[in-house]
Structure formats: C-alpha cells, structure tokens
Interface confidence: low
C-alpha cells in the first residue's frame, strides 16, 4: 500500500505567511506527516507540528479552508502537537501550515506541508519503448498513459540512486500521456518503476499507481534477468490518445516541490564511511587484544548483548522531529529561462527516512502551444496500437494502491510550457561523490 510511499514533498520556502495573522518574532515551527505526506485513500495519517517548549497552543491551517483548520493543545513537553486524520479522503488533501502561540504571541507560519492522496483516479499504464529489455548505452522511453484526460504524470523508481529528469512531450488534444526518455541507458536505470497520474486543478490527488514495470539493462555487470516476483510489463493499451488542456492552471497557483536524494545520499555516504571507520577500528583493536580478553568474549553467555558503543552506534532516528534539529539538506534549483518558461524547484525534505524518487511532470498552458523538440523515440506503431477490444470489461479499478514495500526516491519537476528542451534526458551517471553533470538542472547541495 502507498503508506510505504513515505516521501514528504519538500516544504516550500517561497510562499508568504497567511495575511490574516500577525507574524511575530518567534521562530517558525516544523510541520511533517507520519507515515508520510503521500497517503492512499482510507489510510490514517498524523500531522505533527513542532514548536518550542514555550508553546501554549498549536493551530493548523489548510489552504482554501476556513482558518484555523484545527487547534490543539501541546503534548508534553509542550514542544509539539498532533493533528490526526483517521481516514484519508480528498477533503484532507492539500497544503497545510502550522503556528504556535507562546506568551509573547503567535509564531511565524511553518513551511507548508503538502498532503497528497493516492487512489483518487484509475491507474495509468506504464510501458517501455521500444522494450523494457534495453542494452546499456541505448535509449529507452518510459511511457505513462492514462485512459482519461490527465495533465500531470509522476514516475517513481524504487531505490533510485539519483533523480530522474523528464522532457514533456507536447500536449495533444483529447487524451494524455507523458514520456520519460532515458538516454543513454546505464545500469543505474535498471529497476522497478511505477507511475501516477493527476490533474493540474487538484495537485494533491493522485491516481492509483500503475502496475510495476521492470526495466532490465543488459550489457552491465548486473544479472539482466528480472526478479521472479516481478512481472515485466510491456503492454501499452489503447489509452495513448492525447488530451485537451484541462482548463487553465493559475500561474502562481499551488506549486509542486520535487524531492532529490542528494542529502540522503550524502548522509548515507557519511554513515557508510563512519561504519567502515568503526569496523576498521574494531578490527585494529581486535589485533591487539589479549588472549584473556578473547577468551572472556568467547565465554560470554548466550544472549548477552555486545557492549553498546559510546556514541550509541548508528541508530536510526525514530522521530522525524529529531531529524529536523539537525542539518536540513535541501537542494534547490530555479532554472527559469524566459525562452522556455520553465521553472524547476528541487528540494529535499528533512523528514524522510525512506524517501522515494519520483519524476513529476506538469504542463501549464501559459502561452500558445508550440511543438516541442523532443528526442527521437523509437515508438512502434504496432506496439502503441495494440487493440484491446475488451479494455473496458477487462479493466480493473484497483481498490488498492499497490505500491512497492521498498523505499523509493522522489523527484519533482514542474514544466510551465511545451517548449522545454534541455539536456535533461541524460541523468548523471552516479551521484556518489561525482559532481552533477548538468549544473543548470541538477541541484547542488544546500545546507540550511
């Protein structure tokens, strides 16, 4: 189920405070959701607001709802409050901010939290063109298709090591799809993908996830065979017709934030280095230990625990709030080119323990439609035109948003026109220590 899709959308830093409140000198609180900000329909979610120990009251505001949306007394030791949603529905999806009141007045608003509900629409179809079996160095296009008009598509890769980027194909007239080209394909592209679809007018409502598609890259060191528990999805149904624009989306409207794994990756590398260092120290100490010490170790009764390291070991923090107190790794890019009218905003949420990588594509009809230069993709007419006359009968409205139970990475990109043409089809070979290949598109790490 989608609760495993626990990545929080990065809290937007550019939106001003609500005008109806007097913003005081108090520091802003931190807002997050557990188990995550992307929740499937019917599941429970808890929104947490963490302020200071002086807080007397917390309030949660939801955009476009009468304020305050909810008020709560703080939980001991008074530095946070809990707002519970027992069953996720469309009404709860949206952008939230919280405030706290102390003896000196109300705090500044928190950064916004975007609560997204999945399962709002029927699942799209994800396919790979020309095939999900691709040779390293070649090109492949992942195609996310919705049977009905949609204008936003998200691509998720499980356990991705880097963000994916995406060039949007032009908007057709009556149905819709999004193409996610990958070129040249390397072994890092291999893995399991899913996509979601959504409407621009309700950014916070996503479809059920598509069935998983396993992209298998051959000619690499990895075993090219798919895992027996995963099926290779190759069928693109008849739902590949283009779409008419779904009304106009306000240019200054609800902005999406896309999450990059850089911060998590850096932390992971640091932790890995620390682990190696500790192991090395342990190994070195082991060489110099006396025979008596070794015998004492050998005679330790069964079940006796190893002594805990002085630093507490590499324990995973259980509270997202604890993460917030540390560095907030937030990668931000604003690549706004007057010609292309493209704005990309990349941020890393501080709360994620099990992030996912998502590529998000949204088209805004901000100016007259123009054909977009898109990279040649080896689309097979027969492949796309596979006739499934039983489509309606066979089609299943998934009542479960069956997402993978594995951690996943998330990337969002917002496209404001059809004219985006950047070298964005080539993701960095790896972000493990390597500097981003495309500085105009890939975010450099910013520590706030």
């Amino acid at each position: 189920m989608i609760p495993t899709f626990t990545a929080l959308l990065c809290l937007g830093l550019s939106l001003g405070p609500r005008t109806h409140m007097q913003a005081g000198p108090l520091p802003k609180p931190t807002l997050w959701a557990e188990p995550g900000s992307v929740i499937s329909w019917g599941n429970s979610v808890t929104i947490w607001c963490q302020g200071t120990l002086e807080a007397r009251e917390y309030r949660l505001d939801k955009e476009e709802s009468p304020a305050p949306w909810d008020r709560q007394n703080p939980l001991e030791p008074k530095n946070k409050a809990r707002f519970s949603i027992p069953s996720m529905t469309e009404d709860y999806a949206g952008r939230y901010r919280c405030y706290y009141r102390s003896p000196v007045g109300w705090s500044q608003p928190s950064d916004p939290l975007e609560l997204v509900m999945t399962g709002a629409y029927s699942k799209p179809t994800l396919s790979a063109l020309p095939s999900p079996l691709v040779t390293s160095g070649k090109s492949v296009t992942l195609l996310c298709q919705s049977r009905s008009p949609m204008d936003t598509f998200l691509l998720i890769k499980e356990r991705a090591a880097h963000p994916l980027l995406h060039l949007r194909s032009e908007h057709g007239a009556q149905q819709h799809q999004a193409e996610f080209p990958m070129s040249p394909v390397t072994s890092v592209h291999g893995g399991t993908y899913r996509c979601f679809s959504s409407h621009g007018f309700s950014h916070y409502l996503l479809s059920h996830p598509s069935d998983p598609l396993e992209l298998i890259v051959s000619g690499s060191l990895e075993d090219p065979r798919p895992s027996p528990t995963r099926s290779v999805s190759t069928a693109a149904g008849p739902e590949d017709q283009p779409l008419m624009p779904t009304g106009s989306v306000p240019h200054s409207g609800l902005r999406r934030h896309w999450e990059v794994l850089i911060g998590v990756l850096v932390v992971s590398i640091l932790l890995l280095s620390l682990l190696l260092f500790l192991l090395l120290q342990h190994w070195r100490q082991g060489k110099h230990r006396t025979l008596a010490q070794r015998q004492a170790d050998f005679q330790r009764p069964p079940g006796a625990a190893e002594p805990e390291p002085k630093d507490g070991g590499l324990q995973r923090r259980s509270s997202p709030a604890a993460d917030v107190q540390g560095e907030n790794f937030c990668a931000a890019v604003k690549n706004t080119q007057p010609e292309d009218g493209v704005e990309m905003d990349t941020r890393q949420s501080p709360h994620d323990e099990d992030p996912q990588a998502v590529t998000y594509a949204k088209v805004k009809h901000s100016r007259p439609r123009r054909e977009m230069a898109s990279p040649p993709s080896p689309l097979s007419g027969e492949f796309l035109d596979t006739k499934d006359r039983q489509a309606e009968e066979d089609r299943q409205m998934d009542t479960e948003a069956a997402a993978s139970e594995a951690p996943q990475d998330v990337t969002y990109a917002q496209l404001h026109s059809f004219t985006l043409r950047q070298k964005a089809t080539e993701p960095p070979p790896s972000q493990e220590g390597a500097s981003p290949a495309e500085p105009s598109v890939y975010a450099t790490l910013a520590i706030h």
Epitope: S148, P149, D151, F201, M372
Partner: antibody, heavy 116, light 112 residues
Framework: DVQLQESGPGLVKPSQSLSLTCTVT?????????WNWIRQFPGNKLEWMGY???????SYNPSLKSRISITRDTSKNQFFLQLNSVTTEDTATYYC?????????WGLGTTLTVSS | DVLMTQTPLSLPVSLGDQASISCRSS???????????LEWYLQKPGQSPKLLIY???NRFSGVPDRFSGSGSGTDFTLKISRVEAEDLGVYYC?????????FGGGTKLEIK
C-alpha cells in the same frame, strides 16, 4: 450497457441561458473517461463543445469559452451543459458523448431551438 | 482550427460496390508518439453518430471488417469493400489531436 440521454427545454429565447442534462446509466462518470457535449447544426455540421473528465477537469472549445460551463452531479451520475447568451446561431441538436478510443457512446440527442 | 475537408459531398453507390471517401486535414494530425488521431463516424438517418474507426485504421468494437481506414499525415481514406443497405448515411472524419477537435463536413453515402 452504457447509455447516455440528453434532456433540456427544447426552446430558449435569445440572450437567455441554455441548460442541458446528460444522464448516464451503466457506467459511473467518476470512474473514467471524459464526458462531452457535441452539437450538430441544421445542415449537419458537427461541433465539439467541451468535456468534463471523470475527475472533474473541464476543457472547452475556445470559440465558446466565454459562455460555456460544463458541470456534474456525481450523486445522480449526470453532467450538465450551460450555455449563456444564446442566439439563433445556437439552434442545433445537442449530443452528449463519452470519449474513450473516440466518442464511443452517444446519446440520442436533444433538439434545441433558439427563438423569440 | 484544423479544417477537415471531405470529398465527395455525396457518394451514390450500388449495393455490393466498393465505396471510398477521402478526408484531408489542413495540418498534420500526427502526434509525437507516432499515432495519428483520425477517426471516422457514421450517422444514419435519425440516429446519433457512431464510431467506426479510430487512429486511422483501427476498427472499433463491433464494426464489420468491410470497413477499413488508411492514410497518413494529412490525407486519409475510408473504404467500404461491399456496401450494404445498413451502411447508408453520412460519414464524418474527425481529428482529435488539435484543440478544438474538429469534424469534417460529411459525405452522404446513398443508393444509386
């Protein structure tokens, strides 16, 4: 079986608003697809007017955008066409249709005359 | 708007004959995904239009195989291999790529 049926006033005076209803049976309009209004003028010319998608998104013919609105009542499985400031030029047979591969299901149509 | 021009306006045929209707779009209706969003509809007297062909050559469910569509780019053809009485009516081509989607003016298939 999916069926669509249009209903409306039949006669509207110029400058008034026209309201038509399409009642869908055999399929929920919130499940999938786009639900369209198409009209056919005397002389057989067909014109696409707009749609409301299963999730509530709308799209309209630019030539009508200033005076058209398509809404729905999901509890009744109906969607509606409102056309403001009608003139005699809006005299036509109005069809509702479902968009899937193409317009695969159509209503029988309702004839609307704009006359004073 | 994309103009869809059909020829002929009227097509008198004998039952059992082959019929051919042409349709030309004022601009390409080929999507970048390789698909061409050209459809054909038949409207019989007193009825609403019915979908025959989608994406140039794909017969819709229940449409007899005597109907076939062909063409590319801007020029398209609908062929009926052996005309039957139930095929009589007005045929419309339609483009679904550009906004707004547009219909051709229609070709009336009638008995000679």
């Amino acid at each position: 079986d999916v069926q669509l049926q249009e209903s409306g006033p039949g006669l509207v005076k110029p400058s008034q608003s026209l309201s038509l209803t399409c009642t869908v049976t055999g399929y929920s309009i919130t499940s999938d697809y786009a639900w369209n209004w198409i009209r056919q003028f005397p002389g057989n010319k067909l014109e696409w007017m707009g749609y409301i998608s299963y999730s509530g998104g709308t799209s309209y013919n630019p030539s009508l955008k200033s005076r058209i609105s398509i809404t729905r009542d999901t509890s009744k499985n109906q969607f509606f066409l409102q056309l403001n400031s009608v003139t005699t030029e809006d005299t036509a047979t109005y069809y509702c249709a479902r968009l899937h591969y193409g317009y695969d299901y159509w209503g029988l149509g309702t004839t609307l005359t704009v006359s004073s | 708007d994309v103009l869809m021009t059909q020829t002929p306006l009227s097509l008198p045929v004998s039952l059992g004959d082959q019929a051919s209707i042409s349709c030309r779009s004022s601009q390409s209706i080929v999507h970048s995904n390789g698909n061409t969003y050209l459809e054909w509809y038949l409207q019989k007297p007193g009825q609403s239009p019915k979908l025959l062909i989608y994406k140039v050559s794909n017969r819709f469910s229940g449409v007899p195989d005597r109907f076939s569509g062909s063409g590319s780019g801007t020029d398209f053809t609908l062929k009926i291999s052996r005309v039957e009485a139930e095929d009589l009516g007005v045929y419309y081509c339609f483009q679904g790529l550009h906004v707004p989607p547009t219909f051709g003016g229609g070709t009336k298939l009638e008995i000679k």
